[in-house]
């Protein structure tokens, strides 16, 4: 057992099993579940931390109902197919061949057909809205001092450029935190606003991604920032395609 | 712990090199960044190039250097940096520094090596 | 985005005190480095998160700020503290950018 395997892990993803097989003899972190290769300087895609989810049987978790504006996840756990760089496939089926149409963070964008259904592209969700409420507090957060933090938490944490932060919006206990990035203004290397969206949500519900890390202890000025719930919207560049029975 | 640059010395200008850092007493597949830091004869430090040594390796560069400079890292004990193109500018002191957390944007420097000089001149 | 150190030169007798300043062009909270450098050396690290003293350097180096100012002070000046200060963020790494400060050379009287 050397040092090498000890400096061996991946600090941006628990749900990974890491060794020093790599080229030359350096550190290799696979995903549970699918067995993908990570890149564990940054956060690991939505696709493949949902693949590993599904590898490890946990009490299936139910989400929040849709919102007829955005796309809400609503399906609940899946077991998603990953294109080779952790996208998810456009096309998504589950095992009695059910299909239906993704976005680029993996919610459904179609109504459910069988497998003659084609989906032609990966549309991307370019616009999230999270959608906190806070723990009363005795007195209100200063708005500035809240937007600073959450752009530092988002960097720093999630490794997301600031210019991705599009707006802090708030209204006690109503926070809104907005996430925007166009396919033309994501760069190689730029965090993937779905992935530090879905790293948020499982910091905020107590189910940390990161390895060894205590879980998210946001503070404003010292004074702490609990949150009581959390609901997400996505809005993707090209809208969604369900039947009018499915609004009724 | 100590950090070791070589591949420096003496170029003829549009040619090209490449500088190997090597550490010892410890191994590059941890959960660090390396980067290489230049320094022009009475000048300042002037980023070049970073990379991830553990699962991955991501790669950052400044600006003016892509295209021109690689950074890669083959083997659990060396990063390496390719020059092409090179031209009386690139004359200075090549460094290579750890960064001491897996946080690229979070980084400082907390291990050096001694540095290695570049002349590009005909 | 861009690191503005100031002076770019400052003389001081042997007990005195030296402050030298950072500003960054955008918030970079409390991700900021200090390095001293001695002619034919390289940099070593005395101060990281803006204000943490790192292993071995003295209490008299001490470091303040987070936004977009920052401050170094050497207080109780020694000869050996005669040497070039750099400041240094990564936090925008991913714009290419050079997060070096320019550089202040302190003189010791």
């Known amino acids: 057992h050397t040092a090498a395997q000890d400096n061996c892990t991946c600090p941006t993803n628990k749900m990974t099993v890491c060794s020093p097989d790599g080229p030359g003899g350096r550190c290799q972190c696979r995903a549970l579940g699918s067995g993908v290769a990570v890149d564990c300087s940054t956060l690991t895609s939505k696709c493949l931390l949902l693949k590993a989810r599904m590898s490890a049987p946990k009490n299936a978790r139910t989400l929040v109902r849709p919102n007829e504006h955005a796309l809400v996840d609503n399906d609940g756990l899946y077991d998603p197919d990953c294109d080779p760089e952790g996208r998810f496939k456009a096309r998504q089926c589950n095992q009695t061949s059910v299909c239906w149409c993704v976005n680029s963070v993996g919610v459904r964008r179609t109504d459910k057909g069988d497998l003659s259904l084609r989906c032609d592209e990966l549309v991307r969700t370019h616009h999230i809205l999270i959608d906190l409420r806070h723990r009363p507090t005795a007195s209100a957060f200063n708005h500035s001092d809240l937007d600073a933090e959450l752009r530092r938490l988002f960097r720093e944490r999630y490794r997301l450029h600031p210019k991705f932060v599009a707006a802090v919006h708030y209204e006690q206990p109503t926070i809104q935190i907005e996430l925007r990035q166009n396919t033309s203004q994501k760069a190689a290397g730029d965090v993937d606003i779905g992935d530090a969206a879905y790293y948020f949500e499982r910091d905020v519900k107590g189910e940390s991604l990161f390895q060894g890390r205590g879980g998210l202890d946001l503070r404003v000025r010292g004074e702490p920032l609990q949150v009581e719930r959390t609901l997400i919207y996505y809005l993707d560049e090209i809208p969604p395609k369900f039947s009018m029975k499915r609004l009724t | 712990q100590q950090l070791e640059e070589s591949g420096g010395g003496l170029v003829k200008p549009e040619g090209s090199l490449t500088l190997t850092c090597k550490g010892s007493?410890?191994?590059?597949?941890?959960?660090?960044w390396m980067w290489w830091v230049r320094q022009a004869p009475g000048k300042g430090l002037e980023w070049i190039a970073?990379?991830?040594?553990?699962?991955?390796?991501?790669t950052y560069y400044a600006s003016w250097a892509k295209g021109r400079f690689t950074i890669s890292s083959t083997s659990s004990t060396a990063v390496t940096l390719q020059a092409t193109s090179l031209t009386a500018a690139d004359t200075a002191t090549y460094f290579c520094?750890?960064?001491?957390?897996?946080?690229?944007?979070?980084?400082?420097?907390?291990?050096w090596g001694p540095g290695t000089l570049v002349t590009v001149s005909s | 985005f861009e690191m503005t150190q100031t002076p770019s030169s400052v003389s001081e007798p042997v007990g005195g005190t030296v402050t030298i300043k950072c500003q960054a062009s955008e918030d970079i909270s409390s991700n900021l480095g200090w390095y001293q450098q001695k002619p034919g050396q390289p940099p070593k690290l005395l101060i990281y998160?803006?204000?943490t003293l790192a292993s071995g350097v003295p209490s008299r180096f001490k470091g303040s700020g987070s936004g977009t100012e920052f401050t170094l002070t050497i207080s109780d000046l020694e000869a050996a503290d005669a040497a070039t200060y750099y400041c240094q963020t990564s936090y925008y790494i991913d714009d290419g950018v050079n997060g070096f400060g320019g550089g202040t050379e302190v003189v010791v009287k």
């Open positions: 998160g803006a204000s």
């Open positions: 970073s990379i991830y040594v553990g699962s991955g390796s991501s």
């Open positions: 007493g410890f191994d590059f597949s941890g959960t660090y």
């Open positions: 520094a750890r960064g001491a957390t897996n946080n690229v944007f979070m980084n400082y420097f907390n291990l």
